[in-house]
């Protein structure tokens, strides 16, 4: 009986990008501007997503989908759907609550966003250091030392580091 | 030894999600970033994104980030990544692989796990 | 993105051969540039990593040159199993980016 029910729901013919209008006899009406429905057989279209402020429009709303925001310039996007824009940082740094502070010795960060995190154990591995760690950069691990030729040497200096480094995502 | 053991081939129709797994052996799942490579039937590689499974902390190519969600479940040491609204350019082969110590290269791969979209 | 060109497509060349494969980055990538082996069956290994350094258990007949932009991939001698589709990498800036690969085919 359900499955008859809806099979003579007149709203299951409404496509996305319309609404059922009950002060319409039940009539398919296009979704009002600034409004979407992204499913057929909806009785409401919602109301479309505004990028203001920090948020910048990355894709217009449609009759069918919602717009989505992304971050402008020195911030990036944080949560699901871009939910927060959270400041950028530069690399070798992290952000704390009183703003952008330098990794710790023995971490780094070689990207714009998220934390300092704790160069590579290579031992972990049974590998060797084969590239020194610096703030904006991992360390490189390398063949144990086992593997090493005689007189060879096994750790290289970091390369400089460079801008841009991890672009934010 | 290190080892990335893929979930099987898969047939989808446009529209529909898929969800493929990597499960990770002989090493500590959670030290090492997790990276999904994405290859086109006759074409060259393709970077999806990446996951440290200690804080699940993601990054993605921008190009995948609305077809392309990467998680990690460190109970199991498996790292999965699902792929929203199929097309049929979604077909490919996609593989998980692990860096070699540092993010800057990827030392072990995954055996590949097919995806077909087709109606 | 930092693209990667990688030269040639494909290549035929006899055992024995010494072969080169080049790849250049559209910009700086310092000396974070890998190399990958893919075999027909698919299987990916890498071989080279941080430019130069060879992988444990890589024949020594695998080098790696360069810096900067322009590498190079060579094998001093060409052996039956070595037919593949080889990759260039770089891991300095995300997205990490490859080549478009070379097919290395047995003349």
């Known amino acids: 009986f359900e499955r008859t029910r809806s099979l003579q729901d007149p709203c299951s013919n409404c496509p996305a990008g319309t609404f059922c209008d009950n002060n319409r006899n039940q009539i398919c009406s296009p979704c009002p501007p600034n409004s979407f429905s992204s499913a057929g057989g909806q009785r409401t279209c919602d109301i479309c997503r505004q990028c203001k402020g920090v948020f910048r429009t990355r894709k217009e709303c449609s009759s069918t989908s919602n717009a989505e925001c992304d971050c402008t310039p020195g911030f990036h996007c944080l949560g699901a759907g871009c939910s927060m824009c959270e400041q950028d940082c530069k690399q070798g740094q992290e952000l704390t609550k009183k703003g952008c502070k330098d990794c710790c010795f023995g971490t780094f960060n070689d990207q714009k966003r998220g934390i300092c995190r704790p160069w590579t154990n290579c031992s972990l591995d049974g590998k060797s250091v084969l590239v020194n760690g610096t703030k904006e950069r991992d360390v490189v691990c390398g063949p144990s030392p086992a593997d090493l030729s005689p007189g060879a040497s096994s750790v290289t200096p970091p390369a400089p580091a460079r801008e841009p480094g991890h672009s934010p995502q | 030894q290190v080892q990335l053991v893929q979930s099987g081939a898969e047939v989808k129709k446009p529209g529909a999600s898929v969800k493929v797994s990597c499960k990770a052996s002989?090493?500590?799942?959670?030290?090492?970033?997790i990276n999904w490579v994405k290859q086109a039937p006759g074409q060259g590689l393709e970077w999806i994104g990446n996951?440290?499974?200690?804080?699940?902390?993601?990054n993605y190519n921008q190009k995948f980030k609305d077809k392309a969600t990467i998680t990690a479940d460190k109970s199991t040491s498996t790292a999965y990544m699902e792929l929203s609204s199929l097309r049929s350019e979604d077909t490919a082969v996609y593989y998980c692989?692990?860096?070699?110590?540092?993010?800057?290269?990827?030392?072990?791969w995954g055996q590949g796990t097919t995806v077909t979209v087709s109606s | 993105d930092i693209q990667m060109t990688q030269s040639p497509s494909s290549l035929s060349a006899s055992v024995g051969d010494r072969v080169t494969i080049t790849c250049q980055a559209s910009?700086?990538?310092?000396?974070?540039l890998n190399w990958y082996q893919q075999k027909p069956d698919k299987t990916v290994k890498l071989l080279i990593y941080?430019?130069?350094r060879l992988r444990s258990g890589v024949p020594s007949r695998f080098s790696g040159s360069g810096s900067g932009t322009d590498f190079t991939f060579t094998i001093s001698s060409l052996q039956p199993e070595d037919i593949a589709t080889y990759f260039c990498?770089?891991?300095?800036?995300?997205?990490?980016?490859f080549g478009q690969g070379t097919k290395l085919e047995i003349k």
């Open positions: 692989t692990r860096d070699y110590g540092s993010a800057y290269s990827m030392s072990t």
């Open positions: 002989g090493y500590t799942f959670t030290s090492y970033w």
């Open positions: 996951i440290y499974p200690s804080d699940s902390y993601t």
């Open positions: 910009q700086d990538i310092s000396n974070y």
């Open positions: 941080y430019t130069s």
């Open positions: 990498q770089q891991g300095d800036t995300l997205p990490y980016t």
